[in-house]
């Protein structure tokens, strides 16, 4: 580290006075100081001499004496005060910047140390400071404004109590710069815009920024717009608006429109599109297929998407049949608008009951008219099934009807002993209908069909079921014959009771 | 006022059925779908089925093959009956007044036991 | 079929407390989500329906919201008589319950 004679923290001297400061390294040394006249440097290898056989108050300061090739960057400083009755200030600089929330440091130095208890800080003219200014001394450096904030960029002045009067130093200028996070803020509204030709329009770009310095303009299709500019200030922003304001529009009107703002941070810029029709419109459509099947019981939401302008003047769903003149509930449709012109509409059916399948129209209007979209809803069934015995051209036939969504298959089988259902083990015979004669088949509704097993003699210690399954589940029915006649015997699982 | 009362506990062999009935007063089954709901021993509600207004049935499809749910509209009273049962059946069973989108009145509850 | 989770399983809490439960939807049932209390031996009560409408003679400490897939029932200050377990139930599709909340006395 190097070594500073005289070897004091502080040297005070009256101006005039002859002062040597003499710095000794092993290597090569600098001097670094306040910038300051009448100063001569000499070295001397290891050494280095500033001398001046006339100091001023201007050579307060602190000198600091560094070695450049330490590795560890070692140095020694010394504080001159040239102690002027006339002048208590030496006044480094007079515009400091600084930004907001930073330590922002005056740069005026006591010439004398004796002085320390009476320094203040005012405002030129000897106003007051503002209100929760935060600041300290120090008779090395100056005054230190702690936090300083936007509000704070004044014109300050040192003041020192000389035999009872107050002496100020030159003033210092303030500039407290706010943080600009990045570039301004932007809102381009509408962010969509539809408009009828003939029809008024209104566009607004508007740019805010912590800082004043900031450029704001609005372009169609690469077009800069010549619009007189708004001014503002509020919410501790400066905001600059750009009002686009057309009495009828046409199709050169139309395409896209850019809110472009820049600043020393950078640009940003948000885009509309500016659509002209020539009348009004209205969309239906739905990313579901028009013909949905759900199996009852469950619940199914249908949705609709709208585009439309001008608004909706109404809308509804209706259920159009074929079972019960039931409408849905309002409370199951509920409305969601994406955008402006863009809305979903959805009819929620929770636990689909039988009578609740068929034809939902979705209707809306608009001054161009109305419009509708069906869905179509077929529900799914697990298969019903019942047999009888009966006797079809004198010969003896068990007929099992099976009614179910989609088509029920029909599987008969014939076992041993008498069951409610034929297990595995049992089966002395199994038939599948391929073609069973549907019975009926609407639109909407279960699907009937009839299987016939003609069977010459029924053995009576033997069970004779009818199966049919489809997509949903299965059913299934047991015939039982017995001595006295033939009796049939529904399992518990059957869902139809004949 | 509105109340579901339910038949009393059944202990039942495994195989066999059971039928458990629920009578409704202070309001009418020709208004109100019934729904059966299920709770074994320290476990959540399992929802078996339901018996609309108009008598069809809608079965939760674990139940499907063993459940048959009926009702008689002039006593006012729905049933229940499981077959094929096994040990796992042994649960508390509810009837329920159903208003599609909740439950709103319990009977208070039947017992049955499965077992050997 | 839609599965319900609820959460927590159980709950320690003290008379005053305000109390949370939450219930998960694997998929969207709007708000067509039910709460029922039940108490050890008794039948399940109906609280809450339609997610957030409280049931005619439910004191209002009760409430629930959500929509969708999320939902909870709050219990604003717990009472000595809301100590039971709690169920959500949705009735989108085919009835499903959660698996049920024990809140108990801390």
């Known amino acids: 580290i190097p070594v500073i004679e005289p070897s004091v923290p502080e040297l005070v001297v009256k101006p005039g006075a002859t002062v040597t400061l003499r710095c000794v390294g092993n290597g090569s040394v600098e001097w670094d100081g306040p910038p300051s006249p009448h100063w001569t440097l000499y070295s001397d290898g290891s050494s280095s001499i500033l001398s001046t056989n006339n100091a001023t108050f201007q050579n307060t300061g602190t000198y600091r004496c560094t070695e450049p090739g330490d590795p560890l960057g070692g140095s020694a400083a010394i504080h001159l005060y040239v102690k002027d009755p006339a002048r208590p200030w030496n006044v480094l600089a007079q515009e400091v910047v600084v930004f907001e929330d930073q330590d922002a440091l005056l740069p005026c130095l006591l010439t004398d140390p004796v002085l320390e208890a009476g320094v203040s800080l005012v405002r030129v003219r000897g106003r007051p400071l503002m209100r929760h200014t935060n600041y300290s001394f120090s008779p090395w450096h100056g005054f230190t404004i702690h936090r300083a904030k936007f509000i704070q960029s004044q014109d300050y002045q040192c003041s020192a109590l000389m035999g009872g009067r107050k002496v100020m130093s030159i003033s210092i200028r303030l500039k407290v710069q706010k943080v600009i996070p990045g570039p301004p803020a932007l809102t381009l509204v509408p962010a969509e815009l539809v408009r009828i030709r003939g029809e008024a329009a209104q566009i607004v770009c508007s740019a805010s920024s912590v800082d004043v310095n900031f450029d704001v303009f609005l372009q169609h299709n690469n077009t800069k717009l010549a619009i007189p500019q708004q001014s503002d200030f509020h919410n501790n922003r400066y905001q600059k608006v750009l009002t686009l304001n057309l009495d009828q529009v046409d199709f050169q009107h139309a395409g896209n429109y850019s809110c472009v703002a820049s600043n020393v941070q950078g640009k940003h810029s948000t885009s509309m599109f500016f659509r002209v029709v020539e009348s009004a419109y209205l969309n239906l459509s739905s990313e579901q297929n028009l013909i949905q099947e759900v199996t009852v019981g469950e619940g199914l939401n249908l949705k609709v998407m709208v585009e439309a302008y001008p608004g909706l003047q109404g809308f509804n769903w209706t259920y159009l049949g074929p079972f019960s003149d039931h409408q849905p509930e309002p409370k199951l449709a509920n409305a969601t608008t994406k955008d402006t012109y863009r809305h979903t509409f959805t009819l929620s059916l929770p636990r689909l009951k039988p009578s609740e399948a068929g034809r939902y129209s979705f209707l809306a209007r608009n001054p161009g008219g109305w419009r509708a979209l069906t869905f179509e809803l077929t529900l799914r069934y697990p298969p019903e099934v019942s047999v009888i015995w009966t006797f079809i051209n004198g010969s003896g036939t068990l007929l099992c009807a099976a009614s179910g969504y989609p088509q029920p298959n029909v599987t008969w089988l014939q076992c041993s002993g008498h069951t409610d259902r034929c297990d595995e083990a049992q089966v002395l015979q199994v038939w599948d209908d391929p073609y069973p004669e549907v019975l009926s088949q609407e639109p909407f509704h279960k699907v009937t069909v009839q299987s016939l097993l003609t069977v010459e003699t029924l053995e009576h210690n033997q069970t004779y079921e009818c199966r049919a399954h489809n997509s949903v589940g299965s059913g299934s029915w047991a015939f039982i014959p017995i001595s006295a006649g033939a009796h049939t015997h529904p399992p518990d699982e059957f869902l139809f009771t004949p | 006022q509105v109340q579901l009362v339910q038949s009393g506990a059944e202990v039942k062999k495994p195989g066999s059925s059971v039928k458990v009935s629920c009578k409704a007063s202070?309001?009418?089954?020709?208004?109100?779908?019934i729904s059966w709901v299920r709770q074994a021993p320290g476990q959540g509600l399992e929802w078996m089925g339901v018996?609309?207004?108009?008598?069809?049935?809608n079965y939760n499809s674990p139940f499907m093959s063993r459940v048959t749910i009926t009702k008689d509209e002039s006593t006012s009273t729905a049933y229940m009956e499981l077959s094929s049962l096994r040990s796992e059946d042994t649960a508390v069973y509810y009837c329920?007044?159903?208003?599609?989108?909740?439950?709103?009145?319990w009977g208070q509850g039947t017992t049955v036991t499965v077992s050997s | 079929d839609i599965q319900m989770t609820q959460s927590p399983s159980s709950l320690s809490a003290s008379v005053g407390d305000r109390v949370t439960i939450t219930c998960r939807a694997s998929?969207?049932?709007?708000?067509?989500v039910s709460w029922y209390q039940q108490k050890p031996g008794k039948a399940p009560k109906l609280l809450i329906y339609?997610?957030?409408s409280l049931q005619s003679g439910v004191p209002s400490r009760f409430s629930g919201s959500g929509s969708g897939t999320d939902f909870t029932l709050t219990i604003s200050s717990l009472q000595p008589e809301d100590f039971a377990t709690y169920y959500c139930?949705?009735?989108?599709?085919?009835?499903?319950f959660g698996q049920g909340t024990k809140l108990e006395i801390k």
């Open positions: 329920v007044r159903d208003q599609r989108l909740y439950f709103d009145v």
């Open positions: 202070g309001f009418s089954l020709t208004t109100y779908d």
């Open positions: 018996i609309w207004t108009d008598g069809g049935t």
């Open positions: 998929e969207d049932v709007n708000t067509y």
């Open positions: 339609g997610a957030s």
């Open positions: 139930g949705q009735s989108f599709s085919y009835p499903t």
